[in-house]
Structure formats: structure tokens, C-alpha cells
Amino acid sequence: SSSPTSSASSFSSSAPFLASAVSAQPPLPDQCPALCECSEAARTVKCVNRNLTEVPTDLPAYVRNLFLTGNQLAVLPAGAFARRPPLAELAALNLSGSRLDEVRAGAFEHLPSLRQLDLSHNPLADLSPFAFSGSNASVSAPSPLVELILNHIVPPEDERQNRSFEGMVVAALLAGRALQGLRRLELASNHFLYLPRDVLAQLPSLRHLDLSNNSLVSLTYVSFRNLTHLESLHLEDNALKVLHNGTLAELQGLPHIRVFLDNNPWVCDCHMADMVTWLKETEVVQGKDRLTCAYPEKMRNRVLLELNSADLDCDPILPPSLQTS
């Protein structure tokens, strides 16, 4: 995805000294935390696959790109990156695959330049509603985040809290309207069964939305109308059966949109007629000639673009008196 990358050619590994436990203590100019690699030229710090259990306290103030991937952080507390002086340059933070199961309110506070955040591949059983907004005010200070990567953050079923995972994630996205400037949101591979209806309306700046490899069956209650800047919508590898007229019209009305619909088990019956008509006319669907019917059996493997209304029938529903057991 959009992980922060580095052109760092020379990294200085830290000398094995004791990291200061006092985050308020100003770091030395060229200091590099134990178990990390640093490149001041590339403004990059990499603490990768080191089984760290907490965020290093002595991060250099110059850091712009911070990789903390492949660790064992477990919990990200409030102010996990708050330092004196603050990490004012930190723009890209990658925490993927670090066994985080809890991100607390205000975890990313005091990072005024943070534009890219990747929390992918962490089993987030407890994501605070105020993880990104920092406060429980009804309207928070705007977050600087432009890209938020949350792919595969669903915990195993036995570790989930007794609540909707979709609801928990959406609460964090919407709290305090802090993410109004978000342009890229990736939520792939999270077993989402539905998309709460209010989520997209409150993220008006979105350019790229990735919902691929979830279990979305329908978009009936999802509105794309406000997303006038949306450029790519990834819906591949879901459980979509058909897109209805309202959704089709909204997508067609978005001026820059490209939609990706591969690998959905389309049901080619009478309810598919509008979508087929739309597909034949629209230019917004990428690889539209790859879309094929999965059901019913007599229609299996047929290319949607080659269907006509005569092909699309529904078996009549028999009145109860005529039904056989």
C-alpha cells in the first residue's frame, strides 16, 4: 500500500547504551535508539523485527519516516509519541505487524506533521474511538492525517470484544470529525459484513477507498454521493451479489471515479438487469469484461457484459398453497 518508504542508503546502528526512560529529556542530535537503524540524511528511523515491547523514548527529533514494524508492542498508550521537543517532523509512521491489540485515546497526539499512518496486520481488539482524534470533544482539532492504512486489523474471533468490529473502527474514523482531510483510507481484509451508512458522508476528502477482501454483501445503504473527489474505489473480493440503481447512479455521478469489482459472486437473475445495462454504458469499472456470473447454476461463468434482459429471469415465488416441502 502506501507504506512510508525511505531512500536511505546509510543507516547508523545505535551503540548499545541504555535508552533514556525520560521522554522529556532532549535526545542528542545524532542519537539512535537501541535496536534501531537511523539515517539523518533520509530522516528515517527503522526499528524493524526487533521484538520491541514499547516505542523507543529516545527517537531523534529529525525523524520524518519511522518504521516500527514486526515488533510486539501490544498496547499503544496515550501520547505514545509525545516528546520534548515534539517529533515535529514525523510524517510517516508504520506500525504494521507489531502485535498491537489496543490503541488508546490520544495515542498519536503531539505529532503535528503526521500524514501517513499504517496500523495494518495488527489484531486490534480495542481501538479507542479517540485513537485518531485525541479527545472526546464533539469536534476535535483537525488531524493532519492524509493516509490511514488499516488493512487486516481484525482480531481472531475469540479475541473480539462483544461488539461490532465494523462499529468500533467507524467510531474511531468519525470521532470529533478529526479526519475530514483524509484522502486515502484502506480497510481491506477485515471481514466487514457491512459498511455503516454514515461513515463515507463524514470523510468528504477521500480520493482512495479500499474495501477489498471483506464480506460485503450489499451497498444498498451506503451513499457515495458526497465523495466528489473519489478517484478509486476497491470492492474486489467481497460477497456482492448485485449493485442496485441508487448505487449505480451515485457512482456514475462521481467525476473522477474508477471502481474495481473483480471477484464478487454476482447473481445473474432479474435483479441484475439494471447493473448489466449500466455496465454496458459506463467507463468507470476497471476490467468490466472480467465480471462473471456465479449464480444461479444455469448462468454460471457467463460474462455480465454479454447478458441481455431475456437471460435475466427470476423463478416465480409460489404462493404458500402451491409450495412443496
Epitope: 473483480d262 476490467g287 469484461d289 472480467r290 456470473c293 454460471r300 461463468n301 460474462v303
Partner: antibody
Framework: QVQLQQPGTELVKPGASVKLSCKAS????????MHWVKQRPEQGLEWIGN????????NYNEKFKNKATLTVDKSSSTAYMQLSSLTFEDSAVYYC?????????WGQGTTLTVSS | QVVLTQSPAIMSASPGEKVTMTCSAS?????MHWYQQRSGTSPKRWIY???KLTSGVPARFSGSGSGTSYSLTISSMEAEDAATYYC??????????FGGGTKLEIR
Amino acid sequence: QVQLQQPGTELVKPGASVKLSCKASDYTFTSYWMHWVKQRPEQGLEWIGNINPSNGNTNYNEKFKNKATLTVDKSSSTAYMQLSSLTFEDSAVYYCARGGWDFDYWGQGTTLTVSS
Amino acid sequence: QVVLTQSPAIMSASPGEKVTMTCSASSSVRYMHWYQQRSGTSPKRWIYDTSKLTSGVPARFSGSGSGTSYSLTISSMEAEDAATYYCQLWTSKPPWTFGGGTKLEIR
């Protein structure tokens, strides 16, 4: 009953090219993608690529991009696969198969022998 | 790209015996298909969408699984079941991937 007819055998020399055919009948040819699959003796199945007969769009397995070229003739409901610069490793059975999610009908296969 | 690994590569069973073969995916997939190929013939789609039998396939065959682990089971082996069985990834976009096959012989 859907049928995909393929010639039984082709014998060609190394370095030459060959064009294998697959004639479809008893279904609407343009409504389904056509796939090609390779099987070497005593080996497994290897997907080569597919073609949409309606518009000629193709997809290829990276491994076969410089080896296979897929085309169709809609008027005769026939799919073709040209294999170029043949080597002994290209000796195999080549199947055409109708498909989308899966391959629901297969041809009988053409046994290609590359021999000097 | 998802890799499919079938096991065992070769197995034998006596008539009437229960047979189970597996197909393991390198990452989670939604469904799996199975093909039967008898010696000297082309493959036939046998089971699709993990558990649905193609028309004409005997009811002694069944398929199951989810995520990365799938299996094909024959409740009572018959001589005509001797064949090679291939699993294939559920997808409608390239590439289409097959497992290496399980060769089932009659004992």
C-alpha cells in the same frame, strides 16, 4: 451439450511455431472466457492464459507471455493458441476450457510433440 | 499469488474405504474447486464453490473447508474413483491456480 473440439495431435520441429485450435459448439461463444491449460506428461495443470471472445481481451500467465498468443474467430466460434520458438519443454497436452470462476467444460486436448 | 499445496501426492484406498485428501492455500481464500482427471482423459469439474457437486457426480463425494484449508472426501471408495484430483482457487481474475494434484489409486 457444450462441446470443445481440439485436434488430437501436432508434431513440430524445434524452433518452429504451431497454432492450436479449439472449436466451440452448443453455447454462445462470446458469452464465456476461453482458457488454455498445459499439462506435461505425468505433471499437473498449468494455466496459460485466457481470452474474451467478445472483444479479444487477453490475460496471460507471466511464464507464457512470450510463448503463447491467444486469438479467436467469432464467425467460426473457434479459439486459437499460437506457440512460438518451440523447444522440447513445450511438448505437452494443451487443453482449452470454458470458464470464469471455474472451468466447467474442457476440450479433449491436443498432444503437441516437439521433435527433430 | 496464492500457492496451493495438495497432500498426499499419491495415495491408495481399498474399495469401501473412506478417503480424504487436502488442499492448503498459502493465504486465505473464499472457496475452492476440485477437478477429477482419469488416466488419458481431460479433467472434469467435480466439486465447485468448496462443497457443491457438479451434476452427475456421485453423492459419495463431498467437499469442505474454509480459509486456507480445504478437503475432498469420498465416503466409500469405488474403482471408478481412481484418478488424479486437482484443487483450484476460486477466482474470476488472473491468474488461475491449480494444486499439484493427488493421485488416488485403487488397492
